[in-house]
């Protein structure tokens, strides 16, 4: 006769361990289903009912994994102006931000936005920096606009932002000196990629 398949939750035989994708719940004293990576235990198992799993809600990730699944969902980090997403968040990892390199910017606080290139102007009214697009005067920039219009960048918060570090070749770290005034555009230098 084939061995009887035990369905979770079940009490393990003395001295035996729970199977793959299961964990021993100390409270229930039963073998219960583990939640898949990126899911969390919405309801823990009891002697009569198995673990109820759920994914973290959109914009959140699993910040603390335990054997029974995710114990803590947390909101994804948002990259602040002057920084863009270097590594997107996943079900089990947070967003990583990186400074916008010279010639690129981000003026949002976002968990998805990457650094975008400054628009290229025929005549620059205000140079772009890490947290602001370039402002063009007169004739149209690369991104299509009405002739003769002045393109104003999307306003950022009035708060001052991080002064941006300057990227340099990866043989040696770059140096960024922080002035007591508001941020200035990063010095144009080798991007070191």
């Amino acid at each position: 006769l084939p061995a009887q398949v035990a369905f979770t939750p079940y009490a393990p035989e003395p001295g035996s361990t729970c199977r793959l994708r299961e964990y021993y719940d100390q409270t229930a004293q039963m073998c219960c289903s583990k939640c898949s990576p990126g899911q969390h235990a919405k309801v823990f198992c009891t002697k009569t009912s198995d673990t109820v799993c759920d994914t973290c809600r959109p914009g959140w990730y699993c910040a603390l994994s335990k054997q029974e699944g995710c114990r803590l969902c947390a909101p994804l980090r948002k990259c602040r102006p002057g920084f863009g997403v270097a590594r997107p968040g996943t079900e089990t990892s947070d967003v990583v931000c990186k400074p916008c390199a010279p010639g690129t910017f981000s003026n949002t606080t976002s968990s998805t936005d990457i650094c975008r290139p400054h628009q290229i102007c025929n005549v620059v009214a205000i140079p772009g920096n890490a947290s602001m697009d370039a402002v063009c005067t007169s004739t149209s920039p690369t991104r299509s606009m009405a002739p003769g219009a002045v393109h104003l960048p999307q306003p950022v918060s009035t708060r001052s932002q991080h002064t941006q570090p300057t990227p340099e070749p990866s043989t040696a770290p770059s140096t960024s000196f922080l002035l007591p005034m508001g941020p200035s555009p990063p010095a144009e230098g080798s991007t070191g990629d």
Epitope: G82, F83, S160, T163, S170, S176
Partner: antibody, heavy 125, light 107 residues
Amino acid sequence: QVQLQQSGPGLVKPSQTLSLTCAISGDSVSSDSSAWNWIRQSPSRGLEWLGRTYYRSKWYNDYTVSVKSRITINPDTSKNQFSLQLNSVTPEDTAVYYCAREDGVGGTKDYFDYWGQGTLVTVSS
Amino acid sequence: DIQMTQSPSSLSASVGDRVTITCQASQDISNYLNWYQQKPGKAPKLLIYDASNLETGVPSRFSGSGSGTDFTFTINSLQPEDFATYFCQQYDNLPITFGQGTRLEIK
């Protein structure tokens, strides 16, 4: 579990160079999600952030303006550590120096979550 | 630089008390503020990040609130191990700056 172990002399003569090292275990100095900081603490100035180094496809350094002309923070990928050099020290630089890991550079949730044990550095002849 | 002003600089309280510490930034820092606890001879320890989020493993008697320039840190029902110095820290703008600290002593 991340651990930071500091080493370096506790006594430096005025005008000389203060050099400290912070050895990392449980993370990598070239991690794409951490930054490596030096912070000092003295009774007169409280906690003072000095600077940081971090890697995001390339290395970045940020320094505070008050020590900008005297400070260097360098990563050492072969030994998985980073160092602080502070030149031309004066008795004003006497403090407990801490290395610290920063999580979340450039984003929300940006904080110092792991610290070294601290090194009291006295500048005196 | 952004100045962080903590008050009071020291306070005395008893086990079981509720204590509140305030931190004021010299300009708007949104909610980019963290709170740390430091015991003598030890490094600071993160308690609260982004003004109101409790760090994993930190007891729920600790809490934080505020946004913009005014922030509050509260300990409900003080425990003997809570007597220490507490610091706020802003990361809205470089250089990162700390408050001068609030020393919490046993009454």
